[in-house]
Interface confidence: low
């Protein structure tokens, strides 16, 4: 079947990095400057992505693969294939429409991106606060006073942080 198809369609013989040029009797022509074809048999080449402005080239374009971008320092990628760059904030802050704002009391952010999240409520697990939370760090929960006995571990790790962008249920 493959052999039959290639006899009928000369374009299927064109490898990646070329296109099937209808203007030149369907011969395989190299992709023009700043374009690529990642698969064989293509009738056109795709324009290479250009990483300009806040975007920075992470991987250059070639005749068979598109360029890949990331973000300049002070920004981070958002979206599939780094389609957007979003401003970094400091730890203890979140990005709002008015720029970077400090986390409200009772919330924290230990990253340069994402939203401020509520401190862990130790009492929900019957535990007590061992180390107070800050804008940059969650509280550290310890055992309730009744649980303290010789040889017992005095610290348990905090509950896993929720994914950025998810509000507490």
């Amino acid at each position: 079947f493959e052999r039959t198809r290639s006899l009928q369609d000369p374009c299927s013989n064109c490898p990646a990095g070329t296109f099937c040029d209808n203007n030149r009797n369907q011969i395989c022509s190299p992709c023009p400057p700043n374009s690529f074809s990642s698969a064989g048999g293509q009738r056109t080449c795709d324009i290479c992505r250009q990483c300009k402005g806040v975007f920075r080239t992470r991987k250059e374009c070639s005749s068979t693969s598109n360029a890949e971008c990331d973000c300049t320092p002070g920004f981070h990628c958002l979206g599939a294939g780094c389609s957007m760059c979003e401003q970094d904030c400091k730890q203890g802050q979140e990005l709002t429409k008015k720029g970077c704002k400090d986390c409200c009391f009772g919330t924290f952010n230990d990253q340069k991106r994402g939203i401020c999240r509520p401190w862990t409520n130790c009492s929900l697990d019957g535990k007590s606060v061992l180390v107070n939370g800050t804008k940059e760090r969650d509280v550290v929960c310890g055992p309730s006073p009744a649980d303290l006995s010789p040889g017992a571990s005095s610290v348990t790790p905090p509950a896993p942080a929720r994914e950025p962008g998810h509000s507490p249920q």
Partner: antibody, heavy 113, light 110 residues
């Protein structure tokens, strides 16, 4: 950063390989090029190796110059050298977006009998 | 191969003056053009890419423009440190047309 090595005084006809050692970035992410400059003359492009390993040469360089790479080096193999090949040889990083944004200091090749 | 013709070969201007260097491509190069500064005994330094985008750390006294086959680099408020040779450079190669440098322009600052 980029650093060329291997330049020296050779006699005509002697083959020579120059090496460009890279640090701080991956050769899988950037095109790399060799450019030369004869004493008192302008810049002359020799060839490219792209991120996929494909090679591009100036028409005058085809056959006598060969570019290859390892994970951290880009080599330029030169054969049938003549006195006209006396030049400083630079390696440069760059591709389709920015031109050549990073250059090595160059290495001098002198061809003389 | 594409040919880049750069003019003038040499230009002399006083400190504070303005210099314009021209570069003509033998065919349309779609703004895939860079400009470099090179001082004697040093490696080239990229000033401009994409025909008009200023490279990081380059003073705004340097500006460039152009499209199609005609391009220009302008240096205003000349300083003695601008004395160097300047090269234009076509850098898109996927079609196999090859890379090309202009012949260079020596800028002398009086």
């Amino acid at each position: 950063s980029l650093e060329e090595s291997g330049g020296r005084l050779v006699t005509p006809g002697t083959p020579l390989t120059l090496t460009c050692t890279v640090s701080g970035f991956s050769l899988n992410d950037y095109w790399m090029s060799w450019v030369r400059q004869a004493p008192g003359k302008g810049l002359e492009w020799i060839g490219y190796i792209d991120v996929g390993g494909s090679l591009y040469y100036a028409s005058w360089a085809k056959g006598r110059f060969t570019i290859s790479r390892t994970s951290t080096t880009v080599d330029l193999k030169m054969t049938s050298l003549t006195t006209e090949d006396t030049a400083t040889y630079f390696c440069a990083r760059g591709g389709l977006t920015y031109g050549f944004d990073l250059w090595g200091p160059g290495t001098l090749v002198t061809v003389s009998s | 191969d594409i040919v880049m013709t750069q003019t003038p070969a040499s230009v002399s201007e006083p400190v504070g003056g303005t210099v314009t260097i021209n570069c003509q491509a033998s065919e349309d190069i779609s703004s895939y053009l860079a400009w470099y500064q090179q001082k004697p005994g040093q490696r080239p330094k990229r000033l401009i890419y994409g025909a008009s985008d200023l490279a990081s750390g380059v003073p705004s006294r340097f500006s460039a423009s152009g499209s199609g086959t005609e391009y220009a680099l302008t240096i205003s408020d000349l300083e003695s440190a601008d004395a160097a040779t300047y090269y234009c450079h076509y850098y898109a190669t996927i079609s196999g047309l090859g890379v090309a440098f202009g012949g260079g322009t020596e800028v002398v600052v009086k």
